[in-house]
Structure formats: C-alpha cells, structure tokens
Interface confidence: low
C-alpha cells in the first residue's frame, strides 16, 4: 500500500505543459527539481525560444524533461528520447548562439535514451519536422 502511495502520479499543474498528450507527472524531474513550481520557473526562461518557433517539438521536449510523463505501471519518469532532443537541438541551438548562448548542459542529448524500447522507455517527438517554422514573435537574430 505504501509503495502504491509513493508511486502515484501527480497532475501536471504547469499551464504550458498541459494538453500535450499526457497529463500526469512525478517529481523529481530529469534535472532534479523537486517541485513543479521550480520546474515552471526554469521552463519560463525558454518561453521566448518557443515563441521564436525554432522547433515545433521544443515545447513538448522541454515539458518531457521538466515534467516527465508518469504512469502507474512504471516507477520511473519517462522523459524524451535522444532523437527528439537532437532534432530540437539542431534547430534551436543556432538561435541560442545568435544571442551568445550555448545549449544548456542540463539538456545534453546524450543523457536521454536513443530510442523507446522495453529497456529504456522514452517519448518520441510528435511528428517529424522537414519544414522550418516561421518566426512567431518580434524577436529576430538581427536585433542583437
């Protein structure tokens, strides 16, 4: 009974991570936050990057790291697959570099399983991205 209580998943309370295909998580997350409020604060720092539109998978990827999927059947959080991480990094790292910043070490793609299988469960990205998205906000590389 105690174990089941410990494993129970919690509803995702972070607005930007709701309606992404799963609705429960379990903390700590994949970067060590114990509280969803702490995770949300760190997530907000990526909002401009999401608005910029460098990758359609960025929001899903970040949420899978900061509020990983939880299932009652498995006692570990399910984060992103390495392939999704690499796809997002390939598109968004150049944008960060425009502003003089490197890809965060906390999002190092080698930390995530290369693919979803029985040994290492992870979430694949929601569809592939052959066509880059248009910029959605006034933030442009030329501003700097």
């Amino acid at each position: 009974f105690g174990d089941e209580e410990e494993r129970r998943c919690d509803p995702i309370r972070i607005s930007m991570c709701q309606n992404l295909g799963y609705n429960v998580t379990k903390m700590p997350n994949l970067v060590g936050h114990e509280l969803q409020t702490d995770a949300e604060l760190q997530l907000t720092t990526f909002t401009p990057l999401i608005q910029y539109g460098c990758s359609s998978q960025l929001q899903f990827f970040l949420c899978s790291v900061y509020v990983p999927m939880c299932t009652e059947k498995i006692n570990i959080p399910i984060g992103p697959c390495g392939g999704m991480c690499l796809s997002v990094k390939r598109r968004c790292e150049p944008v960060l570099k425009e502003f003089g910043f490197a890809w965060p070490e906390s999002l190092n793609c080698s930390k995530f399983p290369p693919q979803n299988d029985h040994n290492h469960m992870c979430m694949e990205g929601p569809g592939d991205e052959e066509v880059p998205l248009p910029h959605k906000t006034p933030i442009q590389p030329g501003e700097e």
């Epitope: 970067v31 060590g32 702490d38 604060l41 760190q42 907000t44 720092t45 990526f46 909002t47 401009p48 990057l49 608005q51 960060l96 502003f99 003089g100 910043f101 490197a102 965060p104 070490e105 906390s106 906000t137 006034p138 933030i139 501003e143 700097e144």
Partner: antibody, heavy 120, light 107 residues
Framework: EVQLVESGGGLVQPGGSLRLSCAAS????????MHWVRQAPGKGLEWVAT????????YYADSVKGRFTISADTSKNTAYLQMNSLRAEDTAVYYC?????????????WGQGTLVTVSS | DIQMTQSPSSLSASVGDRVTITCRAS??????VAWYQQKPGKAPKLLIY???SLYSGVPSRFSGSRSGTDFTLTISSLQPEDFATYYC?????????FGQGTKVEIK
C-alpha cells in the same frame, strides 16, 4: 543595438518614495527577464528584483520585499522599480539588466545605472 | 538563501600572470553561475555563464570551471585592460546572489 537606459534616481528623504524607469531598445523586453541590481558606494553588487513581463512573474530580494514593487509596461518596452519607505541603506547606484532565456539566464546587457541617495 | 563566498577579496598581479578567483556556493546550484567584470564607474559586463561557457566577444584568456560547489574564474594571461573587480553570480530560480567581489590590482 540593444540598450537599457535607467532614469528616476535622485535625492530623497528617509521614508520617501522614488520610481525608477528602465527604457529598453533593440529588443522586445516582454520576452526577457528584467532585473534591478544595486551597488552601494564602494560595495559589491546586490540583486534587488526581477520581472518577467510575458507571464507577469515578479521576484524580490528579502531586503526590499514589501517596500519595492517591480513592474513592466510592454507597450513602452520599459521596466519600473517603485521604491517606498526608503532607508539610508537603500542608497546605491541602481542598474537595470536583462537576461535571455535558457542557460540559467545570466545578465548579458546592463544599463549605465542611476544613483539613488537616501538622506535627511 | 544560497550564499556565494568569493575569494580572495583582492589580489595584486602583473601583466602576463595567471589569475584564479574562486566562488563557493553554500549549497548545490547546478551550473547556474555567471562571472562579471566591472570597472570603476561602469556597469558590470558578462564574461562567463553556465559556469564554463564563454560569452560571445569575450577573449579566450577568460575561462570558467566547476568542481562540486566550487566555481572558478581563470585569466590565463592577465592583460592591462583586465585590472578590474570580478563578481560571481548564481541564479537559483527566484533568488539571485552575487559574490562579494575580487579586486584585481596591478602589482
């Protein structure tokens, strides 16, 4: 070119109020963390407050909580620091700085600072 | 609150010297540490972020490293324009703290 220009500093008596402004240009401040950092004469840097206009998030150092209010007017691309119940120890140069998202938001651009003197 | 204890508070060095400044965090701050340079009467300038990443436009003689809760700024070969005060800074979500500063003076 990215620029931050502070204004509103001056001499004020203890218990008085002052409102500082930080006018941003060259970028959309809505999507950045905007900080106020102060430096007392001959002393080090002290973080005061932060606003994230996009989500209306505000954060304060314990030393100013309840006395100072940080805000932003996105239509004017300007951040503000309303300082009430001022004390002698609030005397400092007040800098406004911005932080880009991700990578732990370090402060990559700073204004030139505005001097606040609290004295009777 | 997380405290950043910076040492030394001042040091004297000559052009060409290797200079090392350390900040110790009172608790784990991941890699959320930046380093700034400040000259008298001027605003601080960002040198290093995320503990070890060199900010664009900053000379490569500046570097940062981390070992546990100890963060280090190194200037490999001090130049005349490097005489200034240096500050470390940590951002732990909603709280930001700076080290006390290290003044690098000419010997």
């Amino acid at each position: 070119e990215v620029q931050l220009v502070e204004s509103g500093g001056g001499l004020v008596q203890p218990g008085g109020s002052l409102r500082l402004s930080c006018a941003a240009s060259g970028f959309n401040s809505s999507f950045y963390f905007m900080h106020w950092v102060r430096q007392a004469p001959g002393k080090g840097l002290e973080w005061v407050a932060t606003v994230y206009p996009y989500l209306d998030y505000t954060y304060y150092a314990d030393s100013v909580k309840g006395r100072f209010t940080i805000s932003a007017d996105t239509s004017k691309n300007t951040a503000y620091l309303q300082m009430n119940s001022l004390r002698a120890e609030d005397t400092a140069v007040y800098y406004c700085a911005r932080a880009f998202p991700g990578s732990y938001h370090p402060m990559d651009y700073w204004g030139q600072g505005t001097l606040v003197t609290v004295s009777s | 609150d997380i405290q950043m204890t910076q040492s030394p508070s001042s040091l004297s060095a000559s052009v060409g010297d290797r200079v090392t400044i350390t900040c110790r965090a009172s608790q784990s701050v991941s890699s959320a540490v930046a380093w700034y340079q400040q000259k008298p009467g001027k605003a601080p300038k960002l040198l290093i972020y995320s503990a070890s990443s060199l900010y664009s436009g900053v000379p490569s003689r500046f570097s940062g490293s981390r070992s546990g809760t100890d963060f280090t700024l190194t200037i490999s070969s001090l130049q005349p324009e490097d005489f200034a005060t240096y500050y470390c800074q940590q951002s732990s979500y909603s709280l930001i703290t700076f080290g006390q500063g290290t003044k690098v003076e000419i010997k």
